[in-house]
Interface confidence: low
């Protein structure tokens, strides 16, 4: 209505602080100048503004920068970020790993929305390359967040990067995946001794090839059932039983639990029932 | 056939513990997050907490934070819940769950397990 | 956290009939929303998730639409065997919030 339209005598915003929550929705609209707010963009959190409060907030941004927020506002943009829909985010260039950080700290403990995945999107593009200090940041918000990624993404990782990445990260990938990830994390960690490296290449041997794993089972590194399972079978297919006993140590018992399950099954199927009787499990081919 | 079977509930005294566990069968375990949902009686359904495929992620509600711990042992192809310093308010059928097509909906579920805390 | 209200809290229906039951989420969500159906002393079955994808295995009158923060799950012609209770679940964020049920009953 018109008469809403100017602001009342009084009232008009010298500053953004608490007595803006008594504001209605057109209040603030008539009175809350963009450029102040735009200024003042890190008040807004400390204000326990209603959701409709900060639509119109939003809207002010809007119209103040039509072509895109600058990265001195998005900073500060808190819980406001929930308020924008990936078409706003797309307009944005985020170069800064600490507004990223602020963002992601905002959404911290959901999971990834259709917002922060565009978010990511446009700052790992703005980078060029999944650049380790972002991977740490980006896997310590979101665990899955690398098994998320095409295998044509994961091919900008650098082996740089790899160090950043934990066990939990790996959780979701796909052989896919893991094959590309794999001969990363074997370039990462090519200069560690026998059992550190193995430490640190077990959560990627999901990409591993037949020779690889040859290799390890020279070297006692007692594989754990868990990590065998996650093997690739055409990988494990070629592997003599003598070659799992060697990889799997101790847990080649394991395999009696697993013997219905790939790769497992299709291993046992490839081996001589005489080869298979000298491990003692009654593991039959 | 995907079956999720719960054990362990009982009565237990305000203060006590109960551990539940959840035997799965007729999946790959290990490849899916779980989840432990509680109904307390004639009430809705109330997400408890989430535990993902490796066991290294862990989510809980608020109101369990601190009190109840998720686990699995993929080995064993079975989910835990370890519920301490149980309260009245926590009297409930607590069911188990498999992750479905999306991290957060859940296909298949057990046929859940009564926990009763009184004195 | 996300709050889901359901409506209604309990209709009657009759065989045949057409049944709409609304969930509102209290933030957008975009369709990370599931349906799950309940009988008596009996454990929830899935029967949308993303919304509007039908759990395999449930039949083709169940259907889910919606996005952001409005939802509706719809039986078209209601079998006796749909008497329940309806519950929509949001897994766009933790902590997982479910709707307060809707308890369909027969006429």
């Known amino acids: 209505e018109v008469e809403k339209t100017a602001c009342p005598s009084g009232k008009k915003a010298r500053e953004i602080d608490e007595s803006l929550i008594f504001y209605k929705k057109w209040e603030l609209e008539a009175c809350v100048d963009a450029a102040l707010l735009a200024t003042q963009m890190d008040r807004v959190n400390a204000i326990p503004f209603t959701y409709e409060q900060l639509d119109v907030l939003k809207h002010k941004l809007d119209e103040l920068y039509p072509q895109g927020y600058p990265e001195s506002v998005i900073q500060h943009l808190g819980y406001l970020f929930l308020k924008m829909s990936p078409e706003d985010i797309r307009k944005w260039n985020v170069t800064s790993l600490e507004t990223l950080k602020a963002l992601l700290e905002v959404n911290k403990g959901h999971e990834m929305s259709p917002q922060v995945a565009t978010l990511i999107d446009r700052f790992v593009k703005g980078r060029g390359q999944l650049d380790k200090d972002t991977l740490d940041t980006l896997t310590a918000f979101y665990p899955g967040y690398l098994c998320s990624l095409s295998p044509e993404e994961l091919s900008s990782v650098p082996p740089s990067s790899i160090w950043a990445v934990r066990p939990q990260d790996l959780d979701t990938c796909d052989p896919r995946q893991l094959d590309v990830l794999y001969p990363k994390a074997r370039l990462a960690f090519q200069n560690m001794n026998g059992s550190e490296y193995f430490v640190k290449i077990q959560s990627f041997l999901g990409g591993a090839p037949t020779e690889d794993l040859k290799a390890l089972s020279q070297q006692n590194v007692s594989m754990d059932l868990a990590t065998f399972m996650k093997l690739r079978t055409d990988a494990v297919l070629p592997l003599t039983v003598a070659e799992v006993q060697k990889l799997l140590g101790p847990h080649v018992e394991g395999l009696k639990a697993e013997e219905r399950h790939r790769p497992v099954r299709d291993w046992i199927l490839r081996q001589r029932q005489d080869d298979l009787d000298t491990l003692g499990l009654g593991l039959q081919g | 056939e995907v079956q999720l079977l719960e054990s362990g509930g009982g009565l237990v005294q305000p203060g006590g513990s109960l551990r539940l566990s959840c035997a799965a069968s007729?999946?790959?375990?290990?490849?899916?997050?779980m989840t432990w949902v509680r109904q307390a009686p004639g009430k809705g359904l109330e997400w408890v907490s989430g535990?993902?495929?490796?066991?290294?992620?862990?989510y809980y509600a608020d109101a369990v934070k601190g009190r109840f711990t998720i686990s699995r042992d993929n080995s064993k192809n079975t989910l835990y819940l370890q519920m301490n310093s149980l309260r009245a308010e926590d009297t409930a059928v607590y069911y188990c769950?498999?992750?479905?097509?999306?991290?957060?909906?859940?296909?298949?579920w057990g046929q859940g397990t009564l926990v009763t805390v009184s004195s | 956290d996300i709050q889901m209200t359901q409506s209604p809290s309990s209709l009657s229906a009759s065989v045949g009939d057409r049944v709409t039951i609304t969930c509102r989420s209290s933030q957008g969500i975009g369709s990370w929303l599931a349906w799950y159906q309940q009988k008596p002393e009996k454990a929830p079955q899935s029967l949308i998730y993303a919304a509007s994808s039908l759990q395999s295995g449930v039949p083709s009158r169940f259907s889910g639409s919606g996005s952001g923060t409005d939802f509706t799950l719809t039986i078209s012609n209601l079998q006796p065997e749909d008497f329940a209770t309806y519950y929509c679940?949001?897994?766009?964020?933790?902590?997982?919030?479910f709707g307060g049920g809707t308890k369909v009953e027969i006429k």
């Open positions: 007729g999946l790959t375990f290990r490849s899916y997050a």
């Open positions: 679940q949001q897994y766009n964020s933790y902590p997982l919030t």
């Open positions: 535990i993902s495929v490796s066991g290294g992620i862990t």
């Open positions: 769950a498999k992750r479905g097509a999306a991290v957060g909906s859940f296909d298949y």
